[in-house]
Amino acid sequence: APVRSLNCTLRDSQQKSLVMSGPYELKALHLQGQDMEQQVVFSMSFVQGEESNDKIPVALGLKEKNLYLSCVLKDDKPTLQLESVDPKNYPKKKMEKRFVFNKIEINNKLEFESAQFPNWYISTSQAENMPVFLGGTKGGQDITDFTMQFVSS
């Protein structure tokens, strides 16, 4: 069976939107009005992995681009990157570990935990216009809570 996917945008808990910053980086900033069209649309795929009521394994691709968020070790540190893939083979039900995030729903907010690096989360900074990154702390200065807005296909 083909993998189930939906199109969505994400905003952090301070209502910052995610936009492209160069070919392989996302940044978070406040957008209004027509600028909202700059925000990236994700194709969120529901992939194979350990699942529970509040935890669902997903992969986050950029809609109509052959790019996926992935988590790898760089200089011994878990790092978030945008990785190019062969569009003929992705998305797929069995994604490589580095592409998988546990989508965790808590109090109507979403967290995206790396399946490869437990307790590391997709994060944004309090400051404007800073890169989206993989952070190893929750509840500190950095933001790990998001809301999801559905986008029609």
């Epitope: 992995g49 790898v72 990785e83 083979n89 490589e96 570990k97 580095r98 399946a115 490869q116 690096f117």
Partner: antibody, heavy 120, light 107 residues
Framework: EVQLVESGGGLVQPGGSLRLSCAFS??????????VGWIRQAPGKGLEWVSH???????SYNPSLKGRFTISKDTSRNTVYLQMNSLRAEDTAVYFC????????????WGQGTLVTVSS | DIQMTQSPSTLSASVGDRVTITCRAS??????LSWYQQKPGKAPKLLIY???KLHSGVPSRFSGSGSGAEFTLTISSLQPEDFATYFC?????????FGQGTKLEIK
């Protein structure tokens, strides 16, 4: 010091089954990011990745196996298993287990291998 | 599946020579490539990972380079213990696939 030791190989008839074991020491398969894979080598041939299991139980298989093999782990016994069913002559190979950490993989430590011969 | 093609299949060289082995992928594999050395009757040993990072304990005469779909393993000055078979492995996409091997033999 990390060690991996394979066992369970031997002569089996076509259509038969065999369970290989990979007993390891020097690391824990409950450590996040840790994985153990099976790689085989037919006589005089190259290496072929067979299967892999991560610390969290996530499994991967080479699709060429057509679902005949199953990987599993017993974390408390520090052992990974490869259950091989419906064996064919082309499954004849030395089977190695090897340790890696994180994806993308590179296999840091290897066992010495166990020979599986499928023949009537 | 991603096909990995190594060249040459066999390489004859002498102690002290500089040798290069090439591994080509059928598609872009980023830098997700590792190299292994295997001697007859023994298990493979990791030499290089992430295309160019030397595994601990591996002599500095071994080096790796490349990106995308073409990669090389270089031995700057062959030692007697380097005569063996070398394999590359791509970790970009499941199923993970090896090159067919390059046998390095004494000239």
């Amino acid at each position: 010091e990390v060690q991996l030791v394979e066992s369970g190989g031997g002569l089996v008839q076509p259509g038969g089954s065999l369970r290989l074991s990979c007993a390891f020491s020097g690391f824990s398969l409950s450590t996040s990011g840790m994985g153990v894979g099976w790689i085989r080598q037919a006589p005089g041939k190259g290496l072929e990745w067979v299967s892999h299991i991560w610390w969290d139980g996530d499994e991967s298989y080479n699709p060429s196996l057509k679902g005949r093999f199953t990987i599993s782990k017993d974390t408390s016994r520090n052992t990974v298993y490869l259950q091989m069913n419906s064996l064919r002559a082309e499954d004849t190979a030395v089977y190695f287990c090897a340790r890696n950490r994180y994806d993308p993989p590179w296999f840091v430590d290897w066992g010495q291998g166990t020979l599986v011969t499928v023949s009537s | 599946d991603i096909q990995m093609t190594q060249s040459p299949s066999t390489l004859s060289a002498s102690v002290g020579d500089r040798v290069t082995i090439t591994c080509r992928a059928s598609q872009d594999i980023s830098n997700y490539l590792s190299w292994y050395q295997q001697k007859p009757g023994k298990a493979p040993k990791l030499l290089i990972y992430y295309t160019s990072k030397l595994h601990s304990g591996v002599p500095s005469r071994f080096s790796g380079s490349g990106s995308g779909a073409e990669f090389t393993l270089t031995i700057s000055s062959l030692q007697p213990e380097d005569f063996a078979t070398y394999f590359c492995l791509q970790g970009k996409m499941l199923p993970w696939t090896f090159g067919q091997g390059t046998k390095l033999e004494i000239k």
